[in-house]
Interface confidence: low
């Protein structure tokens, strides 16, 4: 789950084993990152995580912290001297200050930008140093898509029509399909063109040429590559001339999907009659239940919003009898029905509902006890996804894909943008290594945001410090016990030789001197030439 | 191009309290974060209070959260300050702006600012 590396330089040969044994119990410097990409939506705020471990006795002063672009080696932020040195990345960059003393070396990105996407290192020195590249996927959602017939009235069986389907602001480019009432894929006579604006977000326009039958659905399909967000509309021509005379309110069936802080427009159309004029228009828009007033066009004339200043009509396309409504920076708040009321002459109605959604962020993985694993031990797999909208549904399933429904609680909390924060426990018994995947659904958005944990239980290992102090223990010892056999080896020596000597003496003395001077010639130090002579 | 408008500046009794208001024209305010500083005689301007723009989240200089309170009227395009507890040392002139790009204590963060509207403490 983690990319740990350590600092440059930390090959130790064997015969330096003793002084490798001294570097580890000092510490030598970790820099950790998340393996996986960080994935941020455009506009949001992102978490670049890096961690180090301190040494013991560390302060702040030692610290020298440089977050950089991999690539370019660009300065990003730093720390230095024990002090934050400040971004140098467009003002938008912080540390975490309260917990870089505990090794904590994240960078908080503000307002991610598509420009931001890419490799940022982390690099740590305080004795020894360290550094690791995280890397940064950006991504923005795609709006629900946008469906025009070109010709759009007087249809026949029989005419060819080109239906174009519009998807905006979204990244990376999309991935689009079509299909027709019964999910069978349209591919002959489409073309998607995808054009990437000033802040590199793609506008996707996809066409699509069909000769109409009786009545047919059409539907397309933009999918976000990397959210695994699929946004869809469809649209079923029923080709057949409607009366003339009374005012035909019309508004989408199905309800408006808008992404919180974004703009969703309630669509609503009506028939003009021949000889229609603006000043004869009468349009309000209000909310379905209560009533409540939330835009008006009177007089002839535009009377505002009455709805927190956030609704614009469209005034230049009134005349040809769209009434749609502009909702800007949608928010939780908002979901619910909208009514467009529209009097000429005749007059009529129709209630359009707007569907608020948020895609929830990647789920975080994080294991309790989360060191010293061994099979058999339980373990409690929290899996944490943020800021979304409505409550979304969640499934746990093992490396083979079975479902994991025992022994899991699930909790959702909304902020008070009513957005939701899901946490999800797991508790299981580890098996000899195992993969657990945590699947955060938005119901509404069929969005898919997963995380996946692999445990692998070692029962026999240790932790590297304790490696280390285990082999100089050992090698300790065994010296220790090398030295004692050889001191033993040479007392016994040392007496069988003075057994020898006592025997010579009674045998001859002209021996004596040769006798006296034989163990000096072998001798291995002065400390034994003195045990010798005396 | 957006105006501010201050009013309710005045002279105050130690202890008093005093609401400053600011109505901004020109744009979509509900999308705008508002800040309020200070700049006392012969001092530097300082940062005394900001806010979200849909007032959810406020932020207040270290010494003086308690005694002042930042909130807005969206509906009326208006950002308030009021004071309580006022001392001698809150004498300044009190200025309201527009926040863009940036940290919300930083003057440099705001794009546009109000004229300014003087309150002065007696002890």
């Known amino acids: 789950m983690l990319r740990r590396r350590g600092s440059p330089g930390m090959g130790v040969h064997v015969g330096a084993a003793l002084g490798a044994l001294w570097f580890c119990l000092t510490g030598a410097l970790e820099v950790q990152v998340p393996e996986d990409p960080v994935v941020a939506l455009v506009g949001t705020d992102a978490t670049l995580c890096c961690s180090f471990s301190p040494e013991p006795g560390f302060s702040l002063a030692q610290l020298n912290l440089i977050w950089q672009l991999t690539d370019t080696k660009q300065l990003v932020h730093s720390f230095a001297e024990g002090q934050d040195q400040g971004s140098a990345y467009a003002n938008r960059t912080a540390l975490f200050p309260d917990l870089l003393a505990q090794g904590n070396a994240s960078l908080r990105l503000q307002r991610v930008r598509v420009a931001d996407e890419g490799s940022f290192t982390c690099f740590v020195s305080i004795r020894d140093f360290g550094s690791a590249a995280v890397s940064l996927q950006v991504a923005a959602p795609y709006s629900k898509p946008s469906m025009t017939l070109e010709p759009n009235k007087d249809l026949r069986p029989g005419d060819t029509v080109t239906i174009t389907c519009s998807s905006y602001q979204g990244y990376p480019e999309a991935e689009v399909f079509w299909q027709d009432g019964q999910g069978v894929p349209l591919t002959g006579n489409v073309t998607t063109s995808q054009m990437a604006n000033e802040q590199g977000l793609f506008d996707v326009h996809s066409i699509l040429r069909v000769v109409l039958g009786a009545n047919g659905t059409y539907s397309c399909l933009v999918r976000n590559p990397v959210l695994q967000q699929d946004a869809h509309s469809s649209v079923t021509i029923t080709p057949q001339r409607s009366p003339t005379g009374a005012v035909e309110v019309q508004v989408p069936e199905d309800p408006v999907v808008a992404l919180v802080g974004t703009d969703a427009t309630l669509r609503c159309s009506f028939s003009p009659e021949p000889g229609f004029s603006l000043a004869q228009l009468n349009l309000i828009w209000q909310l379905t239940d209560t009533k409540q007033l939330v835009h008006s066009f009177t007089e002839g004339r535009d009377q505002g919003s009455a709805y927190a200043n956030r609704t614009a009509l469209f005034p230049d396309l009134l005349a040809q009898g769209n009434a749609s409504l502009r909702l800007q920076r949608v928010r939780v708040a908002d979901e619910g029905s909208f009514t467009c009321f529209v009097s000429i002459r005749d007059f009529g109605s129709a209630a359009v509902s707007l569907q608020v959604a948020a895609p929830y962020s990647k789920p975080s993985m994080t294991l309790e006890p989360n060191k010293d694993l061994r099979p058999g031990d339980t373990v409690t797999i929290t899996c944490s996804s943020y800021r979304g909208y409505p409550e979304a549904e969640v499934f746990w399933q093992d490396g083979q894909g079975v479902p994991l429904t025992g022994n899991v609680t699930t909790s959702q909390m909304a902020n008070e943008q009513g957005l939701f924060d899901v946490h999800s426990v797991l508790r299981v018994v580890l098996g000899a290594n195992g993969t657990y995947s945590c699947l955060v659904r938005n119901p509404v958005l069929q969005q898919d945001a997963h995380g996946s944990v692999t445990i692998t239980g070692q029962p026999m290992t240790f932790p590297p410090e304790a490696l280390w102090v285990t082999v100089g223990l050992s090698v300790c010892l065994i010296a220790l016990l090398v030295a004692l056999a050889f001191v033993c080896w040479r007392k016994i020596k040392q007496s069988c030789e003075e057994e020898n000597a006592g025997a010579e003496d009674q045998d001859g003395e002209g021996e004596g001197s040769k006798t006296a001077l034989q163990p000096l010639k072998h001798s291995d130090s002065k400390e034994d030439d003195g045990q010798e002579i005396a | 191009q957006v105006q501010l408008q201050q009013s309710g500046g005045g002279l105050v009794q130690a202890g008093d309290s005093l609401r400053l208001s600011c109505e901004a024209s020109?744009?979509?305010?509900?999308?705008?974060?508002m800040g309020w500083f200070r700049q006392a005689p012969r001092q530097e301007r300082e940062f005394v209070a900001a806010?979200?723009?849909?007032?959810?989240?406020?932020y207040y200089a270290d010494n003086l959260e308690g005694r002042f309170t930042t909130s807005r009227d969206n509906a009326k395009n208006t950002v308030y300050l009021q004071m309580n507890s006022l001392k001698p040392e809150d004498t300044a002139v009190y200025y309201c702006?527009?926040?863009?790009?940036?940290?919300?204590?930083?003057?440099?963060?705001?794009?546009?600012w109000g004229q300014g509207t003087q309150v002065t403490v007696k002890p």
């Open positions: 702006a527009v926040k863009g790009v940036g940290w919300p204590q930083e003057q440099a963060s705001y794009d546009y």
């Open positions: 020109g744009g979509t305010f509900s999308s705008y974060a």
């Open positions: 806010i979200s723009s849909e007032g959810g989240s406020t």
